[in-house]
């Protein structure tokens, strides 16, 4: 009941933590203008990874995409290719945790490899958390870094005189929806590691005892603990451990049910 | 088509008190900024408040901050100036205008003028 | 707030003259989000409220004739009436959109010979 329980924790707290993964990467406002110690403008600035927007005082907001491709900075390229694999890895760890739930029957799958698939979404589940954090985090300190260079143009050139206001940029909204949303995700990936492990032990408490009263180790153990063995054999004996060291390349070439986020 | 038109300005003494109003029809009132600006009789203009859609928001410049109060009824399509201790130098033609795109005054009422003097 | 200077205070023209007037700020009205000027400029003719000719510096507001043009970028402005007409006669503002209090110039006024 724990297991099940922890595991369907897991996948809605990703489910939630996917979703504001998505709506992060979405969102415009990554970076708003800093209006602090700022001469009062009627224009608000704010951008996002696919856009910029004003919003005039008069109500009307404008909003432009970036249509280059090459123009763009390089860490802004970076940041959306981090929020897109982490958008991607949460797909998919979705899709594999939902055939992944214990409450949930499909045919005769064994729990062997319900908890397979449980481990593997959860991993992709940590990893997707992991690029959106990493996506934001590179943007926030990309902003940092801007901002306090803007800062120190800002008071230079004509004796104090400003002739031109350089409009500095500080966190918006959409970070603090990514650190959280990435977060979550990482904390439902750990649910659903946690939970696999859960599977695991009427599984190989029965297993145990067939293998001391039969002798058959070999039969028993079809892969045992090798990392290598990843998902290839399905049969009721096989110890659910099997992914533990589980290599990347099985990882992705088998679907996981914790890839939603 | 857009129609503003502004009542309430009269006659009053330094230190009184005014308030005036502008009714708005042919746009939707509830989508707009709008503002108060006044016309000195030396042709000179100068906003005197503005306030966005919704009300949530409000601007005065320092010359009548905290003597007038802009608000609006968006059920009644109603700008309003609420104008107190009023000066000589608040003597002026009033007009109501609505924001439009580039923070730009695209419609403007035909005013209402506001004379303070003993 | 802002300083808006207006140039010339006032000028005569005779009917289908090219007419320039200047508008300068004391910032720049340039807003890097958008890459447009927060100059405006309207029309007040006789007796009338102002009217709103162009915005960003040079859209023209729908109605007005395409004899007038907006131009210029940052702290230097300039509205060009083509070639000026009998019902031109009015004084032209222009307006800081970018900085509160919005403040105008304190005009240019068109008479025709």
């Known amino acids: 009941m724990a297991v099940t329980a922890c595991q369907g924790l897991g996948f809605v707290v990703s489910l939630i933590g996917i979703a504001g993964i998505i709506a992060a990467t979405c969102m415009d406002q990554w970076s708003t203008q800093d209006l602090y110690n700022n001469p009062v403008t009627a224009v608000f600035n704010y951008q996002g990874l696919w856009r910029s927007c004003v919003r005039e005082s008069s109500g009307f907001t404008e909003c432009r995409g970036y249509f280059t491709l090459l123009g763009l900075p390089a860490m802004l390229q970076a940041v959306r290719a981090l929020m897109i694999v982490g958008i991607v890895l949460g797909a998919i760890g979705l899709l594999v945790s939902i055939f992944a739930l214990k409450c949930i029957r499909i045919g005769s799958m064994e729990d062997s490899a319900k908890a397979n698939m449980t481990l593997t979404s959860g991993i992709m589940f940590i990893v997707s958390g992991l690029c959106a954090i990493a996506g934001v985090s590179v943007f926030a300190n990309m902003l940092v870094t801007n901002f306090w260079m803007s800062t120190a143009n800002m008071y230079t050139g004509m004796g104090g005189m400003v002739q031109t206001v350089q409009t500095r940029y500080t966190f918006g909204a959409a970070l603090f929806v990514g650190w959280v949303a990435g977060g979550l995700t990482l904390i439902g990936g750990v649910m659903m590691c946690i939970a696999c492990r859960g599977l695991a032990p009427e599984e190989t408490n029965y297993k145990a005892v067939s293998y001391h009263a039969s002798g058959h180790s070999v039969a028993y153990k079809p892969g045992g603990f090798k990392a290598s063995t990843g998902f290839g054999s399905n049969t009721k004996n096989k110890k659910i451990y099997d992914g533990g060291a589980r290599t990347e390349d099985e990882v992705q070439s088998y679907p996981s049910k914790h890839d939603y986020v | 088509e857009v129609q503003l038109v502004e009542s309430g300005g009269g006659l009053v003494q330094p230190g009184g008190s005014l308030k005036l109003s502008c009714a708005a029809s042919?746009?939707?009132?509830?989508?707009?900024?709008m503002s108060w600006v006044r016309q000195t009789p030396d042709k000179r203009l100068e906003l005197v408040a503005t306030?966005?859609?919704?009300?949530?928001?409000?601007y005065y410049p320092d010359s009548v901050k905290g003597r007038f109060t802009i608000s609006r009824d968006n059920a009644k399509n109603t700008l309003y100036l609420q104008m107190s201790s009023l000066k000589s130098e608040d003597t002026a033609m009033y007009y109501c205008?609505?924001?439009?795109?580039?923070?730009?005054?695209?419609?403007w009422g035909q005013g209402t003028l506001v004379t303070v003097s003993s | 707030d802002i300083q808006i200077t207006q140039s010339p205070s006032s000028l005569t023209v005779t009917a289908g003259e090219k007419v320039t007037m200047s508008c300068q700020s004391s910032?720049?009205?340039?807003?890097?989000?958008?890459?447009?000027?927060?100059l405006t400029w309207y029309q007040q003719k006789p007796g009338q409220p102002p009217k709103l000719l162009m915005y960003?510096?040079?859209t023209r507001e729908s109605g007005v004739p395409d004899r007038f043009a907006g131009s210029g970028s940052g702290t230097d402005f300039t509205l060009t009436i083509s070639s000026v007409q009998a019902e031109d006669l009015a004084i032209y503002y222009c307006q800081n959109t970018y900085y509160y209090p919005f403040t105008f110039g304190s005009g240019t006024k068109l008479e025709i010979k």
């Open positions: 910032q720049s009205l340039l807003n890097s989000g958008n890459h447009r000027n927060y």
């Open positions: 960003w510096a040079s």
């Open positions: 205008a609505r924001l439009s795109y580039g923070n730009s005054f695209a419609n």
């Open positions: 306030i966005n859609s919704n009300g949530g928001s409000t």
């Open positions: 042919g746009f939707t009132f509830s989508s707009y900024g």
